[in-house]
Amino acid sequence: LEVQVPEDPVVALVGTDATLCCSFSPEPGFSLAQLNLIWQLTDTKQLVHSFAEGQDQGSAYANRTALFPDLLAQGNASLRLQRVRVADEGSFTCFVSIRDFGSAAVSLQVAAPYSKPSMTLEPNKDLRPGDTVTITCSSYQGYPEAEVFWQDGQGVPLTGNVTTSQMANEQGLFDVHSILRVVLGANGTYSCLVRNPVLQQDAHSSVTITPQRSPTGAVEVQVPEDPVVALVGTDATLRCSFSPEPGFSLAQLNLIWQLTDTKQLVHSFTEGRDQGSAYANRTALFPDLLAQGNASLRLQRVRVADEGSFTCFVSIRDFGSAAVSLQVAAPYSKPSMTLEPNKDLRPGDTVTITCSSYRGYPEAEVFWQDGQGVPLTGNVTTSQMANEQGLFDVHSVLRVVLGANGTYSCLVRNPVLQQDAHGSVTITGQPMTHHHHHH
């Protein structure tokens, strides 16, 4: 009897369900009464699940397995493994016996993504060029063991003086701690990349260290640490400053703003004059403030496409740079609520309530609740579509079975603006009517 399983391992995330596929070709006239099906762990031969004497004998594996009973007669002997754990990883053998006998083994590869690394510095204050610092990169709850790579701010790999340790917790998930020891230069960016080799998932973080007293001549450029949040259609100021030395003149200044990732020029000031905007004519400097070290950039009529990182390069005799992030946002409109069907409603009827909110950014979070504040999470389908400007229209559909009466409320949240827009509908009466209440 030929039993077929996938050649490649089945990859399953911790906590999700996995299907271990196994199939055979039933002969004409085959009946389930003839079938003996056994799933077992290949190495230990521990019984996992079985089907015999025409019936499912159930799970022998922590009550987390199931067959597909409706599909057995067609030759589908696959096993469903629920709430996958690290300990489930390994080989499972599918034995099928009718008159003849056949078996095949399928591998389960368990995986869990690593968290975004957190970076810590020791010591973390009063740092000076020449100091030795220890940078720790920590990422949590991943599986299998990670690969860790360090590099500087220009992509140069840092492989010396790196110590990486990985510890498994009770669930078998790994916490990875990688320590880099470096001697500080004038300033430096140190980046750590944690890779999950099975998921081919990269999690990375970087830290930029600017020692207190830069060596003579290096330009210290300062920008806000937090992203600048700007509403679509408004103007935004990307702040950037430097400390001019006595006797500084604008003729010495080279100022360049560019997009950090693509290096596209945004705006520049060179040879003692403003070279103007290279970015859709929507940028401006503050010319009267440049001599005092204010290199900030004004971005007009902000669009969704502007979101990202902008780098401010300042060169006088020496050079410095820093990047500032622009986070674009747009408030969501007050939701409109529609009912389908919307008349002759009776208790027991199923209705579809649609909550629609328009032209927001970034994507919204949608929450439903009833008139007593009880969350409604079942039978909710939410879709978000971006228009040409990149703004999202959100449509969330709730299917409910009507009681005697009820209030259904939808809240649309903009996660950046922390702005809530909500609408509700109350369905009452016999014969039923419905009213819209907006709060």
Epitope: F149, P157, G185, S191, L193, H204, K263
Partner: antibody
Framework: EVQLVQSGAEVKKPGSSVKVSCKAS????????IHWVRQAPGQGLEWMGY????????DYAQKFQGRVTLTADKSTSTAYMELSSLRSEDTAVYYC??????????????WGQGTTVTVSS | EIVLTQSPDFQSVTPKEKVTITCRAS?????MNWYQQKPDQSPKLLIK???NLASGVPSRFSGSGSGTDFTLTINSLEAEDAATYYC?????????FGQGTKLEIK
């Protein structure tokens, strides 16, 4: 337009030195490392080393340690590669290249046109 | 030193064919870049960070892989794809290239 323009071909005697220049334009010279890669006739690409024009940090492939010197002049946005004690095996095309990208992914996005160095007695 | 071994060294293929070039690293690397070099020209960036197409590169080129095994695929080869292809890593010093794979069009 971002460009790296290299100096012209050179013919050198064994035991002598050669200095190849690479002039950058169209971008902030100090923001990226410049690497040197050579290619002997009919052979593959071989990395020689890099310079960070801002900090002037350098690193060289073991094979060229002691024989190659990389420098950079910020005022003219030019990088230089000097190879000494030349031998016939150093006959090759020498390329400079900009190492670009952003954390954590980097790559050579701009290459010079190459400088042919011929070592012959 | 991480050694990158490409296979094959040489391949003669007909237009419209699918071509796969592999690059195996002697130790795990964080990502791989791929370059195309035509005769008497400088190398040109093709694929960055394992799987991202460089600007202006036709969509018939693609990259994949992880750890020690990486692949460059050309779907439906065209005559202009005759060139030598190199993989490159700099996850650890020194920076290394593969020995190159020369593609000839029949």
């Amino acid at each position: 337009e971002v460009q790296l323009v290299q100096s012209g071909a050179e013919v050198k005697k064994p035991g002598s030195s050669v200095k190849v220049s690479c002039k950058a334009s169209g971008y902030s010279f100090t923001s990226y490392t410049i690497h040197w890669v050579r290619q002997a006739p009919g052979q593959g690409l071989e990395w020689m080393g890099y310079i960070n024009p801002n900090s002037r940090n350098t690193d060289y492939a073991q094979k060229f340690q002691g024989r190659v010197t990389l420098t950079a002049d910020k005022s003219t946005s030019t990088a230089y590669m000097e190879l000494s004690s030349l031998r016939s095996e150093d006959t090759a095309v020498y390329y400079c290249a900009r190492y670009s990208g952003s954390t954590p992914y980097w790559y050579f996005d701009v290459w010079g046109q190459g400088t042919t160095v011929t070592v012959s007695s | 030193e991480i050694v990158l071994t490409q296979s094959p060294d040489f391949q003669s293929v007909t237009p419209k064919e699918k071509v796969t070039i592999t690059c195996r690293a002697s130790s795990s690397v964080s990502y791989m870049n791929w370059y195309q070099q035509k005769p008497d020209q400088s190398p040109k960036l093709l694929i960055k960070a394992t799987s991202n197409l460089a600007s202006g590169v036709p969509s018939r080129f693609s990259g994949s892989g992880s750890g020690t095994d990486f692949t460059l695929t050309i779907n439906s080869l065209e005559a202009e794809d005759a060139a030598t292809y190199y993989c490159q890593q700099w996850s650890s010093n020194p920076l290394t290239f593969g020995q190159g794979t020369k593609l000839e069009i029949k």
